[in-house]
């Protein structure tokens, strides 16, 4: 087949036609439609929305749209036995109770089925004891407490502020420290930007607002009862005691009004330094326990949530490719929300909906993409990326053979300052080239490209004149595709100015105040940032699905591999004596990176020169590009994390949201000076260098001439 046979529109107009069809007004309309009631995973409302999306995607013109259901472990509060935290006096009387629900936002007072704030998958329990304030509950915060301040959290209830790291890591750290309960709260220092009013008058978190969220440590497992396999009708399910990643101690989230009541009475040690102080009018004493007058008072948690196997529904839409129908480009984002989902996820789902509509319009005019595009509306992302992971587990054999790329589409905005992109290095050039062709929506950049405003506002720390592109971590639905299956992945959204707004995420994240009005009044009244994100996400999908040669540049991987090798080497070199004693060498890794660089360079030269009219050679070169990401997968996975199999990138062991490079080596080196058996510890470092070097070399060889 001729390479243009996929379309009846001249190739250079394809992308333009697609982009021109995207309309801000439609995204606005879709967002409104998706946010009028809650769409909690496992509820009838979210099933109805799945069926609505299925119906609309069919109307838009997709070839097929199916629901894929799974029965997974979810978690809900007990409707008749609410969760709360008390301060109790010496007689056991409750003298203060945290609130049972958030004050409903204006206009939503009569909406039913708003799930009250809770920590999903918390076990039941009513622990009582003294409180210890543990800052953000990061690894380094517990090091400070235990090693420097000699404060023992064993048998204590800890209170931690949200932010900096994934909440599941906080809970894991608290468990390891021996705590018997965890209270999570949003401090105004992290969730209240100065000079901005609280919702409903602005985009800041009010004192009664609370962040919901799961507290699992799944490490990529998906449904806790069926790790590695789909939670289908004939699934074998583990017992709850063997479930993956469940917390073992009660956990509950509160807002800063309630946190004030708990923290204002804290006694014991003063905070170690100013980084432990938030913005409440409290001393931020660490404890344990309350100060003098209140020393006989204790904190008691009342947690009655239940874990239930519940049916969830993904929507999977297919637009069949005309030339390479067995090559899949996937655009996926989740549909389930904690409450209204004004930003998370529906600002993303509305963009996906408009992208599907635009592709459908082109298809109705006779166009088809070269490769198959799959569109996904994932369920139960908020409960641990469950919908996407179960679908990928069910379809893993197809995906590992046919998956070209995955583009994630959760929240389109977390601010309105500039673009934010996290992706595989293979996509750097695609993103650069695409954003140079798109108009910037930013004030002061009229008539300028998105690339220009993005580069100005978020410059690369390494390369002048280029924008920052970050590593993929986790905490979203690309995880299974990238970290487990090795499918090239990327994500894009509009973000805040990290320089001036140092709060974590956006203030109303996972609260009842994430409404349509939040977006329409305060973040993006014209929906111009949503439109830009639609153009970036949709443009990436278009290019990945339609370009004759896959728009991947393997040379960019070579550059970052060298950077990551330098970084991990410098970490190791903080222990020069031990490296000498245990004969630790990075030579093999640097050699492999050098080989990769040379082979990638030669491959790129061949890519420029080969005969693109020869479909066999074209397919061969494209397959080498497609399978390069796959080549970084170690089938054995990372130590104790079998579903994190990518050797170059994994979610940080200390923060699921963050990406770590050469994670196997990094984790082997982490806190190595405290290991009881240094010989064994440095032996593991050497083994991880070996695995990394082998993997880089093996990946390089996939780019060599095939014969």
């Amino acid at each position: 087949k001729s390479s243009n046979e996929a379309t009846n529109i001249t190739p250079k107009h394809n992308m333009k036609a697609f982009l021109d069809e995207l309309k801000a007004e439609n995204i606005k309309k879709f967002l409104y439609n998706f946010t009028q009631i809650p769409h909690l995973a496992g509820t009838e409302q979210n099933f109805q929305l799945a069926k609505q999306i299925q119906s609309q995607w069919k109307e838009f013109g997709l070839d097929s749209v199916e629901l894929a259901h799974y029965d997974v472990l979810l978690s809900y509060p007990n409707k008749t036995h609410p969760n709360y935290i008390s301060i109790i006096n010496e007689d056991g009387n409750e003298i203060f109770n945290t609130s049972l629900f958030e004050p409903p936002p204006p206009g939503y007072e009569n909406v039913s089925d708003i799930v009250p704030p809770f920590s999903a998958f918390s076990p039941q329990g009513m622990p009582e004891g003294d409180l210890v304030y543990v800052n953000y509950a990061r690894t380094e915060d517990f090091f400070k407490l235990e090693r420097d301040m000699k404060i023992n959290c064993s048998g204590k209830i800890v209170i931690a502020r949200y932010g900096k790291v994934f909440r599941g890591n906080k809970v894991k750290n608290a468990q390891l420290a021996g705590a018997k309960g965890v209270i999570l709260y949003s401090d105004p220092a992290d969730y209240f930007a100065p000079g901005v009013k609280s919702y409903p008058d602005g985009w800041n978190l009010p004192g009664g607002g609370v962040q919901r969220g799961n507290i699992l440590n799944l490490n990529g497992a998906g449904d806790p009862l069926t790790p590695g396999y789909p939670a289908n009708e004939y699934a074998y399910r583990r017992g709850i005691a063997e479930a993956v990643g469940l917390p073992s101690i009660p956990v509950h989230p509160i807002g800063y009004y309630d946190a004030q009541k708990l923290l204002e009475k804290m006694g014991g040690s003063a905070p170690p330094d100013s980084s432990w102080r938030g913005s409440l009018k409290v001393p931020y004493n660490v404890g344990p326990g309350f100060t003098g007058n209140f020393s006989t008072q204790k904190v008691k948690m009342h947690i009655h949530s239940t874990n239930e196997v519940t049916r969830i529904y993904n929507v999977i839409g297919t637009l069949r490719g005309a030339v390479e129908p067995d090559r899949y480009v996937i655009l996926g984002g989740h549909r389930d929300s904690w409450v209204f989902g004004g930003i998370d996820p529906q600002s993303g789902a509305a963009v996906v909906h408009e992208i599907v509509r635009s592709f459908g319009t082109l298809k109705k005019e006779g166009w088809r993409p070269r490769r198959t595009i799959l569109f996904a509306s994932w369920d139960a992302e908020e409960f641990g990326l469950l919908g996407s992971t179960e679908w990928a587990e069910e379809n893993s054999r197809l995906l590992q053979e046919r998956g070209v790329a995955y583009i994630n589409a959760d929240s389109s905005i977390e601010g309105n300052y500039t673009l934010r992109v996290d992706c595989t290095p293979l996509m750097y050039s695609l993103v650069h080239n695409l954003t140079k062709e798109l108009k910037s929506p930013d004030e002061g950049f009229e008539g300028k490209s998105l690339y220009e405003s993005w580069t100005k506002k978020s410059p690369s720390p390494e390369f002048s004149g280029m924008p920052r592109i970050s590593k993929l971590g986790s905490g979203n639905d690309f995880e299974v595709f990238f970290q487990r299956l090795g499918i090239a992945s990327g994500r894009a959204r509009y973000t805040k100015n990290w320089e001036t707004n140092k709060f974590s995420g956006y203030p109303l994240y996972h609260s009842v105040y994430e409404t349509y009005e939040l977006v329409e009044k305060f973040y993006d009244p014209m929906f111009k940032y949503h439109l830009t994100v639609a153009q970036v996400r949709g443009g990436m999908v278009f290019e990945l699905a339609n370009s004759i040669v896959l728009p991947f540049d393997c040379r960019d991987y070579a550059v970052v591999l060298r950077k990551y090798a330098d970084k991990i080497y410098s970490i190791s070199m903080k222990h020069p004596q031990e490296m000498k004693t245990y004969s630790v060498s990075f030579d093999s890794l640097f050699s492999a990176v050098k080989n990769f660089t040379e082979i990638a360079s030669k491959f790129s030269e061949r890519l420029q020169d080969f005969d693109k009219s020869n479909p066999i050679v074209l397919r061969m070169m494209n397959d080498q590009l497609m399978f390069l990401e796959r080549a970084f997968i170690d089938p054995l996975g990372l130590p104790d994390r079998p579903f994190y199999r990518h050797v170059i990138y994994a979610p940080s062991s200390h923060n699921k949201y963050a990406g770590e490079s050469f994670p196997g080596i990094y984790d082997a080196l982490f806190d190595i000076e405290s290991k009881v058996d240094p010989s064994k510890a440095w032996g593991e470092v050497k083994r991880q260098i070996y695995v990394a070097a082998f993997t880089v070399q093996a990946a390089a060889e996939t780019l060599s001439e095939v014969a």
Epitope: Y84, F96, N97, T98, S99, L100, F101, E102, P103, P104, P106, G107, E109, N110, P206, G207, G208, G209, G255, Y257
Partner: antibody, heavy 122, light 111 residues
Framework: EVQLVESGGGVVQPGRSLRLSCAAS????????MHWVRQVPGKGLEWVAV????????YYADSVKGRFTISRDNSKNTLYLQMNSLRTEDTAVYYC???????????????WGRGTLVTVSS | QSVLTQPPSVSGAPGQRVTISCTGS?????????VHWYQQLPGTAPKLLIY???NRPSGVPDRFSGSRSGTSASLAITGLQADDEADYYC???????????FGGGTKLTVL
């Protein structure tokens, strides 16, 4: 305009019970803590009780503790005060008042009803 | 006997400035609890005049101002007008009583 309207006052004998209601004309009722404050005619104000917006916390003045119960029904935008074992010294105009901060108990009163007179007399 | 002490009455001629004091103790105002002020015109319900020591709700003229220092607070009224004639109450929180406390009220007479 936002309004609070008390009802249920009247003459009652000592030892008997009475239930006061306070109807709010706004949907945002469910986001505010609510108080009862009383005033003996010609005298000063005395705070009686408060309930948080969600009912999770209720606090009482020592003079009424164990006898009075404050409650609310957010679906009806209504606040209640159940008064048992009434005494002659409970005679007063009873005002319902809204707490000054949405979603919190800041313990001041930014909106008052007109009051309902309770007379405890044999 | 009220927990917060106010003068029973104050007076002033139209246009003058008057202040009403409110004295507490280390368990209320002195414990850094906020002070609020209410105006009660004859035959009506009280109305919030000053909240959190020195803030005026919308609609309250800037002739009214509040301050707090140590264990006491005060309300100042400048440019006295005839319709300012009313009872004025201060209010705070007391951590010994674990409850809201009021002053006994001050009757302002405009001469």
């Amino acid at each position: 305009e936002v309004q609070l309207v008390e009802s249920g006052g009247g003459v009652v004998q000592p030892g008997r019970s009475l239930r006061l209601s306070c109807a709010a004309s706004v949907r945002t009722f469910s986001g505010y803590g609510m108080h009862w404050v009383r005033q003996v005619p010609g005298k000063g104000l005395e705070w009686v009780a408060v309930i948080s917006y969600d009912g999770s916390n209720r606090y009482y003045a020592d003079s009424v503790k164990g006898r009075f119960t404050i409650s609310r029904d957010n679906s009806k935008n209504t606040l209640y005060l159940q008064m048992n074992s009434l005494r002659t010294e409970d005679t007063a105009v009873y005002y319902c008042a809204r707490d000054g901060n949405w979603g919190s108990l800041d313990l001041y009163f930014d909106l008052w009803g007109r009051g309902t007179l309770v007379t405890v007399s044999s | 006997q009220s927990v917060l002490t106010q003068p029973p009455s104050v007076s002033g001629a139209p246009g003058q400035r008057v202040t009403i004091s409110c004295t507490g103790s280390s368990s209320n105002i002195g414990a850094d609890y906020d002070v609020h002020w209410y105006q009660q015109l004859p035959g009506t319900a009280p109305k919030l005049l000053i909240y959190v020591n020195n803030n005026r709700p919308s609609g309250v003229p800037d002739r009214f101002s509040g301050s707090r220092s140590g264990t006491s607070a005060s309300l100042a009224i400048t440019g006295l007008q005839a319709d300012d004639e009313a009872d004025y109450y201060c209010q705070s929180y007391d951590n010994t009583l674990s409850g809201v406390v009021f002053g006994g009220g001050t009757k302002l007479t405009v001469l």
